[in-house]
């Protein structure tokens, strides 16, 4: 049978030939010609055999971490007969481990984030090294972890590689730490190999700082001409925290005048001082307000860091602006009777310089030929006014500072021209009437109405009469309807076209004004040749024809 012991080859042997062991048949007694053969993966390349003796040699450096065992086959033949002396047999050559691999951190790079101010013992991260050596071969792959850099803030558990906090850290002093961990095999004994890794530990922010004004006093200015909503300046507090923990809100703590407001620009974390009400240099030329700032988000457990909000004082100086003249009223309404003579007094406007220097004021009227204004603001007429032409005048009065002609203000002035009874009533239209030759007495010839260009104080009332001449010898009479109309009636029977073809009647119309005005209005009445039915249509038609130069049958 075969005689051999278990075969071992230490890995990483530098010799070109390392004696592994010996294959032997117990029939090999020295008196026979035996030849030993080696077969299988690695035979002839990694392992050779002295076929005379059965001695096996490793002729290559072996790496257990690449291959830990070789399965080979052994043969022995008698070279004199060529026959196998023993059945072919399989055997194993094991590559024995040496500590030739250092621990390696395969999951590099390591990075961890831990909140600042975390208490001692807080777990940060676990680092794990791998050792390619045989874990069952002594302590070649038994690791111990230690901290090379990172004291006194961190510690590492020797057997697990768990990194913990050993001292509180303030992100505002240092926001990241490089920790170097060493892993040693052979549980740290002499001859151990080591590997290191770096761990970047970043401190995440907690809101342990309140915002603080760096300036205890801000000086701002605002022009008195600034409209409400104007940003007049910014104030800024600083918060050593970052991100959401540095977001802040500004507010006004004191402002008796309630003239200002503060809004927060959440992008820049600045406080913007806003004008809430317009200011007037002449009324108050400086203000003092107090602003405060606090964080937008504060966790309940961190309230101890935010007990008293930081404040600052803001002095606001109002800048004087040369303001335009200011009229006493936003507009003026004056009244003047029509027909008053040129140079008549209309009214007085008044504007003053609101500034301290009190510049004298010059007045002017924009585009008016009817009115004039002097340096005292007195408006007079340049012409007699006729209400019936214009009852109202819309003037634009301009006030200009004498010392700065660019400072101008304008206001509307409305002048109402008051009525006087300067117009008599008159026919509301032109009247041309017709009467048939065969007309009877009392026949209505025409209804007339009147108009008066004057303004009625209460309500116009007109009085209609025939002139004295027409009253005495008239063929017609008038009846006043008492409603500002009157009717003309025939005062006889029968008219003769040939003898008197046309009548001109003078009608007096009086108004109820004081004094009353009367006008004389002529009514023309044509005598017509009417048909038997006495139709005025025919009469009117015939008259129409006549008036056009045609003769009718």
């Amino acid at each position: 049978g075969w005689v051999w012991n278990q075969f071992f080859v230490p890995e990483e042997m530098n010799t070109t030939s390392h004696h592994v062991g010996r294959l032997r048949s117990d029939l090999d007694n020295g008196n026979n010609s035996f030849q030993y053969k080696l077969l299988g993966a690695g035979a002839g390349s990694t392992f050779i055999i002295d076929e005379r003796t059965g001695d096996i040699y490793a002729i290559e450096k072996l790496d257990r971490e690449e291959r830990s065992l070789y399965i080979l086959r052994a043969q022995v033949i008698d070279i004199t007969t060529g026959r196998a002396v023993e059945p072919e047999s399989e055997f194993v050559i094991k590559v024995s481990d040496i500590n030739d691999n250092e621990p390696k951190f395969l999951d590099e790079p390591y990075e961890a984030i831990v909140p600042e101010m975390s208490p001692e013992g807080t777990l940060v991260i676990q680092v794990t090294a791998s050792d390619a050596d045989d874990p069952s071969s002594g302590n070649n792959a038994r690791l111990l972890y230690s901290l090379l850099q990172g004291q006194p803030y961190f510690s590492v558990e020797p057997t697990t590689g768990v990194i913990r906090i050993s001292s509180k850290m303030d992100r505002e002093l240092q926001d990241e730490y490089w920790v170097i961990i060493q892993a040693k095999d052979m549980i740290g004994q002499p001859g151990a190999l080591s590997g290191t890794t770096s761990v970047l530990i970043k401190l995440s922010d907690v809101n342990d700082n309140k915002p603080i004004f760096k300036e205890s006093l801000y000086r701002l200015t605002v022009s008195e001409s600034a409209p409400t909503g104007t940003s007049i300046g910014t104030i800024m507090a600083y918060d050593n925290d970052i991100g959401e923990n540095a977001e802040m809100d500004y507010s006004i703590e004191e402002d008796d005048s309630q003239t200002f407001d503060i809004i927060t620009n959440h992008e820049t974390q600045e406080g913007i001082v806003i004008l809430k009400k317009k200011v007037n240099f002449e009324h108050q030329n400086h203000y003092g307000i107090r602003a405060k700032v606090k964080n937008h988000h504060v966790d309940e457990q961190l309230m101890k860091y935010h007990t008293e909000a930081s404040t600052t004082f803001i002095k606001i100086q109002v800048e004087d602006v040369d303001e335009p003249p200011l009229f006493l009223l936003p507009y003026y309404i004056f009244e003047i009777f029509e027909e008053t003579p040129q140079g008549s007094f209309v009214g007085v406007v008044s504007a003053t310089d609101p500034d301290n220097r009190k510049s004298p004021i010059r007045y002017s009227i924009t585009r008016s030929k009817v009115f004039n204004i002097d340096d005292n603001g007195t408006i007079t007429t340049t012409n007699s006014l006729d209400r019936e032409i214009s009852a109202w005048y819309n003037l634009s009065i301009t006030a200009t500072e004498k010392y700065n002609i660019e400072q101008i203000s304008s206001i509307p002035v409305y002048v109402q021209v008051l009525n006087i009874n300067d117009h008599a009533p008159e026919f509301s239209q032109y009247y041309e009437s017709y009467v048939c030759e065969n007309a009877g007495s009392g026949q209505v010839i025409q209804t007339i109405s009147a108009v008066d260009r004057d303004e009625s104080i209460e309500e116009h009332h007109f009085y209609f009469n025939l002139s004295v001449e027409d009253t005495n010898s008239s063929s017609f009479t008038i009846i006043d309807n008492q409603d500002n109309t009157a009717v003309i009636l025939t005062n006889r029977t029968g008219f003769n076209l040939q003898e008197e073809p046309i009548f001109y009647i003078s009608i007096l119309i009086a108004d109820n004004g004081i004094p009353s005005l009367t006008s004389t209005n002529t009514l023309t009445i044509h005598v017509c040749d009417c048909d038997d039915s006495g139709s005025t249509q025919t009469c009117q038609y015939q008259e129409l024809m006549l008036s056009m130069g045609f003769k009718t049958e």
Partner: antibody, heavy 120, light 108 residues
């Protein structure tokens, strides 16, 4: 009667390859049962076994020289050869070829030897 | 490898005397694979004994070998003038084949 005869240059330059041939007469290398060996003897020193070859071509070399030695066989010429590469002065020696009995593992026939000097 | 140590390094004897040469192995060697050689100046070595005790062809019977394990002996019972030479022991029980450093037998 088996006879062995070494032949080859007596002088080799350092770093070059030493080449020797052993011609066998009086018996066939191919007959089997024998291994054919090379041995050397440094001047005034003992013997050092270099390696062997079987007619089939299987070889085995002294581990101390393995990386530099090649032994080959030419059965048609009834010869076997030695090549030793990268020689230095330490390789200066008398080189013997010999027959190795497969049963006794003893070197029963030897050539007379040839001195090879390594020198530039 | 097995180291063979021969003693004495030089043995001075007169013809007719008995010579005893020793060969000690660094580890046990099968007696089947120990041989003795004789080398005269300018000549190749000649096989005397194989298998620790078997004489090679043509070797006179005054040469004999013995021993086992780690201690082996070559004995020349009565020295002849042609026996004065250098003697080497050799093992091939395990690889590589190794030789002793030699014992020089010289005429006294």
């Amino acid at each position: 009667q088996v006879q062995l005869q070494e032949s080859g240059p007596g002088l080799v330059k350092p770093s070059q390859t030493l080449s020797l041939t052993c011609t066998v007469s009086g018996g066939s290398i191919s007959s089997g049962g024998y291994y054919w060996s090379w041995i050397r003897q440094h001047p005034g020193k003992g013997l050092e076994w270099i390696g062997y070859i079987y007619y089939s071509g299987s070889t085995f070399y002294n581990p101390s020289l393995r990386s530099r030695v090649t032994i080959s066989v030419d059965t048609s010429k009834n010869q076997f050869s030695l090549k030793l590469s990268s020689v230095t002065a330490a390789d200066t020696a008398v080189y013997y070829c010999a027959r190795d009995s497969s049963s006794s593992r003893a070197l029963d026939y030897w050539g007379q030897g040839t001195l090879v000097t390594v020198s530039s | 490898e097995i180291v063979l140590t021969q003693s004495p390094g030089t043995l001075s004897l007169s013809p007719g005397e008995r010579a005893t040469l020793s060969c000690r192995a660094s580890q046990s060697v099968s007696s089947s694979y120990l041989a003795w050689y004789q080398q005269k100046p300018g000549q190749a070595p000649r096989l005397l004994i194989y298998g620790a005790s078997s004489r090679a062809t043509g070797i006179p019977d005054r040469f004999s070998g013995s021993g086992s394990g780690t201690d082996f002996t070559l004995t020349i019972s009565r020295l002849e003038p042609e026996d004065f030479a250098v003697y080497y022991c050799q093992q091939y029980d395990s690889s590589p084949r190794t030789f002793g450093q030699g014992t020089k037998l010289e005429i006294k």
